[in-house]
Interface confidence: low
């Protein structure tokens, strides 16, 4: 490690022999301390301009002792002004002052770059009293210095409402270059230019930059930090880093991967979440994005049926969420489904195709020839109908739903009955006399309830009077 100490002018003689507790680092000299019997004179030499009188930060005490002897001005002694050392070394420096014993309770504080150093710092103050003066040595030590310890350190002492300030001690911690900006990973278009930036600082300065691509240096001559590397374009992935050099040595940045944007990988894990008669809800897991954000996806649907024309339905959707409800499908049909997604470069291949089926639908036609008449002897309404002509996709008939609405004197009540698929007639109890009963019938499959037939009305008279006028729904072609 390079360690430099520039000792300033020392116009005062040393204490005879070393003082306890005044250990020095290997780059500082023993500080100038006063004789135990003398005062420090007011005239001092400037640390920056030796030989010139220095009347800087001194306190001129006005208090006199019992014998009315005027006290001389007080000032910190000069010490080493500039310490240069390597990172992680230990350093100790101090300031000293001789104070007449008439001053009680003097304390010394350490300041760095204008801020007082409080708390867990290694500051020790030692007092060496004599008959008339006390020599005070304030030591400050730093273990394993960091760059953050760089700065200007001073001592301050308050006496008689006067503040005495020492000359600054400049600590300069030198080390390997420290990156303030490193290259960043990027995803770039093939054969398109892009820039990478690298910046590092000392001390010591200057810091020179070399660029490295896939373990080979890019520039023969170093560039002064900061450096911008313009890469004219890449055809394949590359790893870039930069080397920062100063007098202390070399620091290498993180290696960053520059990826070439490509078409995405096909989506995977296409899954069926829910099927209805006319829709299928699917999800998928996107493939690798090809280093470029997905823009949208395409859901491709083919009907798997020997009689279908093999045409593909295409549904475009956003890339996220990775779900899509395919609508407008045939009931009870088999489909093959694939998903493809695109980024700025292009479309992925289609995912592995999966098979999915829609469920059976509800019937699309109502029962035919609905007739309704009153069976007075049983006090019920007899209803008859014909089975509707349903398509295969509607699935297997499981029964019928009968709606009968009773209206009398402003009161209306709807009731529903379910009957099995083998029935083509039903009887319902009369609910209200002197009322109109309106009947509608719908076919039911596992896919749901079909449309209701047109309403058929019958009047239910008061007891003892019967109207046998039935209504009906004619079958198609029988009108």
């Amino acid at each position: 490690a390079i360690t430099e100490a520039r000792e300033e002018a020392k116009p005062y003689p040393l204490f005879p022999g070393p003082l306890p507790g005044s250990l020095q680092t290997d780059h500082t000299s023993l500080l100038s301390l006063p004789h135990t019997s003398g005062y420090q004179p007011a005239l001092m030499f400037s640390p920056t301009q030796p030989g010139r009188p220095y009347t800087g930060n001194v306190a001129i005490p006005r208090v006199t002792s019992a014998g009315s002897k005027l006290l001389p001005p007080l000032a910190f002694k000069h010490t080493v002004g500039h310490i240069i050392l390597s990172e992680h070394k230990d350093v100790k420096f101090n300031c000293s002052i001789s104070v007449p014993n008439i001053y009680q309770d003097t304390t010394i504080s350490w300041w760095k770059d204008g801020k007082e150093l409080l708390g867990a710092h290694h500051a020790i103050t030692q007092f060496y009293p004599d008959d008339e003066v006390t020599a005070i040595i304030a030591s400050f030590s730093i273990t394993s210095v960091q760059r953050s310890d760089n700065g200007s350190y001073i001592c301050k002492m308050k006496i008689n409402n006067e503040e005495i300030v020492s000359d600054p001690i400049y600590i300069e911690v030198q080390g390997l270059p420290h990156f303030t900006k490193q290259p960043e990973s990027m995803n770039v278009t093939r054969n398109t230019a892009f820039n990478l930036t690298c910046q590092a600082v000392g001390p010591p300065e200057p810091v020179n930059i070399f660029w490295v691509q896939n373990s080979s240096r890019v520039n023969e001559q170093p560039e002064k930090s900061p450096s911008v590397l313009t890469v004219p374009g890449l055809t394949e992935m590359a790893v870039f880093s930069c080397e920062a050099h100063n007098d202390k040595g070399l620091t290498v940045s993180k290696g960053v991967q520059i990826n070439i944007k490509a078409i995405p990988s096909p989506p995977t894990e296409v899954s069926i979440h829910n099927s209805t008669a006319h829709s299928i809800l699917i999800s998928w897991v996107p493939g690798f994005d090809g280093y470029s954000p997905f823009r949208n996806c395409s859901v491709q649907v083919k009907e798997v049926d020997p009689l279908s024309n093999g045409s593909v339905m295409i549904f475009n959707t956003s890339a996220s969420p990775h779900m899509y409800q395919i609508k407008q499908l045939q009931a009870l049909a088999n489909y093959s489904i694939g998903v493809s997604c695109m980024n700025e470069i292009g479309w992925s291949a289609v995912s592995p195709w999966i098979l999915a089926s829609t469920t059976e639908g509800a019937p699309s036609v109502a029962p035919l020839n609905v007739t309704v008449f009153l069976n007075e002897s049983r006090d019920n309404v007899d209803i008859r109908w014909m089975k509707p002509l349903t398509k295969r996709q509607a699935g297997e008939l499981v029964g019928y739903r009968i709606s009968h609405v009773w209206q009398s004197a402003g009161i209306s009540k709807e009731l529903l009955e379910e009957v099995g698929q083998n029935n083509s007639r039903a009887q319902i109890s009369v609910q209200v006399h002197n009322a109109t009963c309106t009947v509608r019938i719908a076919a039911v499959t596992k896919g749901g309830v079909g449309p209701f037939s047109d309403p058929v009305k019958i009047f239910i008279p008061a007891h003892g009077w019967v109207d046998h006028a039935p209504s009906s729904t004619p079958a198609p072609g029988n009108a």
């Epitope: 990988s265 894990e269 999800s283 994005d289």
Partner: antibody
């Protein structure tokens, strides 16, 4: 190398909101993938909470749907979890992770942050 | 949601012994992913898409299965394999994890 770091308060009072931050280095959260929150309850059960995708879309666990919000700050490369109306049942270690891509699952995880819900 | 049931919940194995952990799904899933977790650390991706080993995973590990039944196998148990292993599915939202199998060394 991709790194994720969770941060946030370790103690939250019941009925308050839990807010956590996940700071991502080594990969831009807009560059791809799905940026996910997972939690692990004291009995070690893991629960996928939801994600925010690279383009800002969300997907949440239905069990949390009304309480959870995942947002992001692309300028800071961070994404956030907000869980409202917490109860002691929300006491867990919360992890953020990157999900999707070639491996199609959570390939990078944060080290986790422990959150206790207690009055 | 799809429930993943792992068995056994806890098991011990001697060094060199073959170990199999199973994961059953309440509905069919397309792939299973596996994570390893050691105390005080976050889960690590161990096996992805049923049978692919994540980076740095020893070759003594393997994964297999389809539909609702999946397994993770260690051909010869080693001390460093002692950990909790979780299965995970991403075939259906919400993504779910198994309850974990704690594998101890005898």
């Amino acid at each position: 190398d991709v790194q994720l770091q969770e941060s946030g308060p370790g103690l939250v009072k019941p009925s308050q909101s839990l807010s956590l931050t996940c700071s991502v280095t080594g990969y831009s959260i807009t560059g791809g993938y799905y940026w996910t929150w997972i939690r692990q309850f004291p009995g070690n059960k893991l629960e996928w909470m939801g994600y925010i995708s690279y383009d800002g879309d969300n997907n949440y666990n239905p069990s949390l749907k009304n309480r959870i919000s995942i947002t992001r700050d692309t300028s800071k490369n961070q994404f956030f979890l907000n869980l409202n109306s917490v109860t002691t049942e929300d006491t867990a270690t919360y992890y953020c992770a990157r999900e999707g891509g070639r491996l199609r699952t959570m390939d990078y995880w944060g080290q986790g942050t422990s959150v206790t819900v207690s009055s | 949601q799809i429930v993943l049931t792992q068995s056994p919940a806890i098991m011990s194995a001697s060094p060199g012994e073959k170990v199999t952990i199973t994961c059953r799904a309440s509905s069919s899933v397309n792939y299973m992913h596996w994570f390893q977790q050691k105390p005080g650390t976050s889960p690590k991706l161990w096996i992805y898409t049923t049978s692919n080993l994540a980076s740095g995973v020893p070759a003594r590990f393997s994964g297999s299965g389809s539909g609702t039944s999946y397994s993770l196998t260690i051909s010869r148990m080693e001390a460093e394999d002692a950990a909790t292993y979780y299965c995970q599915q991403r075939s259906s939202y919400p993504f779910t994890f198994g309850s974990g199998t704690k594998l101890e060394i005898k």
